[in-house]
């Protein structure tokens, strides 16, 4: 019951997180004009990953897309890439986790497969959340650097009579949305991984019983069957089972690269 709740909650938290990552990526307010030097501006500038906007006090807002790809800063391209990777991984993770949910029955899917899928989606959510947090943090760092550079320029270039107020940008709402959303996706992913660990022992115990049952029945059957099964003495049988169990644990704890394809 607790495992189902943990898995369900992990799914919901990740879903909210990924929705937030998508929202942050689409938002125009990644950086907003710093109004410290000019709090009474009649023109307000803000920028996103895809376009920059100007809102006039008249109520008119004009947005212009970044129609160039090569002319954009490498950092901006990197942030875009991180956010998109985060969204893609998160979306795949959501798809996988829907089928992995314990409360949903799909055909004759075994619990071991559900455990694998839960872990896979959990890892995907963790990576997705990290991508979003990294993307937002890189952008924030870029803003801080530019902010102090423009502040330095502002106070060194005041020699003339005419004031040229340089537009400085500070953190926009999208950054906070991105950080929170990334964190939620990360937490959701961790919860999915915890849920998977909760699923794994149940499966192992179940298999252990089945193996023991077949092992005992073999002891009473003719030798020909024994030979055909490939099991030797009881010790040999146990060793093979242990090995099988260990391999299965490894699959659950450390998915192979094929699990992501």
């Amino acid at each position: 019951m607790a495992v189902t709740a943990c898995q369900g909650l992990g799914f919901v938290v990740s879903l909210i997180g990924i929705a937030g990552i998508i929202a942050a990526t689409c938002m125009d307010q990644w950086s907003t004009q710093d109004l410290y030097n000019n709090p009474v501006t009649a023109v307000f500038n803000y920028q996103g990953l895809w376009r920059s906007c100007v809102r006039e006090s008249s109520g008119f807002t004009e947005c212009r897309g970044y129609f160039t790809l090569l002319g954009l800063p490498a950092m901006l391209q990197a942030v875009r890439a991180l956010m998109i990777v985060g969204i893609v991984l998160g979306a795949i993770g959501l798809l996988v986790s829907i089928f992995a949910l314990k409360c949903i029955r799909i055909g004759s899917m075994e619990d071991s497969a559900k455990a694998n899928m839960t872990l896979t989606s959990g890892i995907m959510f963790i990576v997705s959340g990290l991508c979003a947090i990294a993307g937002v943090s890189v952008f924030a760092n870029m803003l801080v650097t530019n902010f102090w550079m423009s502040t330095a320029n502002m106070y060194t270039g005041m020699g003339g009579m005419v004031q040229t107020v340089q537009t400085r940008y500070t953190f926009g709402a999208a950054l906070f949305v991105g950080w929170v959303a990334g964190g939620l996706t990360l937490i959701g992913g961790v919860m999915m991984c915890i849920a998977c660990r909760g699923l794994a022992p149940e499966e192992t115990n179940y298999k252990a019983v089945s193996y023991h049952a077949s092992g005992h029945s073999v002891a009473y059957k003719p030798g020909g069957f024994k030979a055909s099964t490939g099991f030797g003495s009881n010790t040999k049988n146990k060793k093979i089972y242990d090995g099988g169990a260990r391999t299965e644990d490894e699959v659950q704890s450390y998915p192979s690269k094929h699990d992501y394809v």
Partner: antibody, heavy 119, light 113 residues
Framework: DVQLVESGGGLVQPGGSRKLSCAAS????????MHWVRQAPEKGLEWVAY????????YYADTVKGRFTLSRDNPKNTLFLQMTSLRSEDTAIYYC????????????WGQGTSVTVSS | DVVLTQSPSSLTVTEGEKVSMSCKSS????????????LTWYQQKPGQTPTLLIY???TRKSGVPDRFTGSGSGTDFTLTINTVQAEDLAVYYC?????????FGAGTKLDLK
């Protein structure tokens, strides 16, 4: 057609008060910022105050700050300018105007209402 | 506050002549965000209310004759009337619409000989 009609002007004693109104029609009043601009006799234009569409931002010229209060009633499509502690230099024609256009430009202006501050 | 200085204060021209008037700002009115200058030009004919001529320093309002041209950037702006007509007799004001208070210039009075 956009129409702005000012009212409430007249003769006021120095130190007195007056409330000007501007009735708007022909556009979605609640969506646009509104301004008051005045013009003293034989003088140039002087911007007085601005109020945003939802009254979230209100700005005043330094010459009227603390004496004039700008407000609006969106359901009634009306703009108000409450003037107190009036001085002789406040004598002017008061226009209400709207930033209906791009570039914060004041495209539509009322015909103005005359305020005379004199003893 | 942004101070706008208009020159000359008055101009006397003959019909058909080309005329230019200047408006200088104490601060830059150029907005980096959209690469536009937030300066507006108005025309006020005798006994009438002001009317909008040009916004964003150089964009003519629809319906304004193309003989009116706005130019300049940053702190220096110019309004040019290519062939002055009798109906252009008016006072021309420039206005800062970049930051509050939205100051006006003192105006340039255009007279005909």
């Amino acid at each position: 057609d956009v129409q702005l009609v000012e009212s409430g002007g007249g003769l006021v004693q120095p130190g007195g008060s007056r409330k000007l109104s501007c009735a708007a029609s022909g556009f979605t009043f609640s969506s646009f910022g509104m301004h008051w601009v005045r013009q003293a006799p034989e003088k140039g234009l002087e911007w007085v105050a601005y109020i945003s569409s939802g009254s979230g931002s209100i700005y005043y010229a330094d010459t009227v700050k603390g004496r004039f209060t700008l407000s609006r009633d969106n359901p009634k499509n009306t703009l108000f300018l409450q003037m107190t502690s009036l001085r002789s230099e406040d004598t002017a024609i008061y226009y209400c105007a709207t930033s209906y256009y791009y570039g914060n430009a004041l495209e539509y202006w009322g015909q103005g209402t005359s305020v005379t501050v004199s003893s | 506050d942004v101070v706008l200085t208009q020159s000359p204060s008055s101009l006397t021209v003959t019909e058909g002549e080309k005329v230019s008037m200047s408006c200088k700002s104490s601060q830059s009115l150029f907005n980096v965000g959209n690469q536009k200058n937030y300066l507006t030009w108005y025309q006020q004919k005798p006994g009438q209310t002001p009317t909008l001529l040009i916004y964003w320093a150089s964009t003519r309002k629809s319906g304004v004759p193309d003989r009116f041209t706005g130019s300049g950037s940053g702190t220096d702006f110019t309004l040019t009337i290519n062939t002055v007509q009798a109906e252009d007799l008016a006072v021309y004001y420039c206005q800062n619409v970049y930051s509050y208070p939205l100051t006006f210039g003192a105006g340039t009075k255009l007279d005909l000989k």
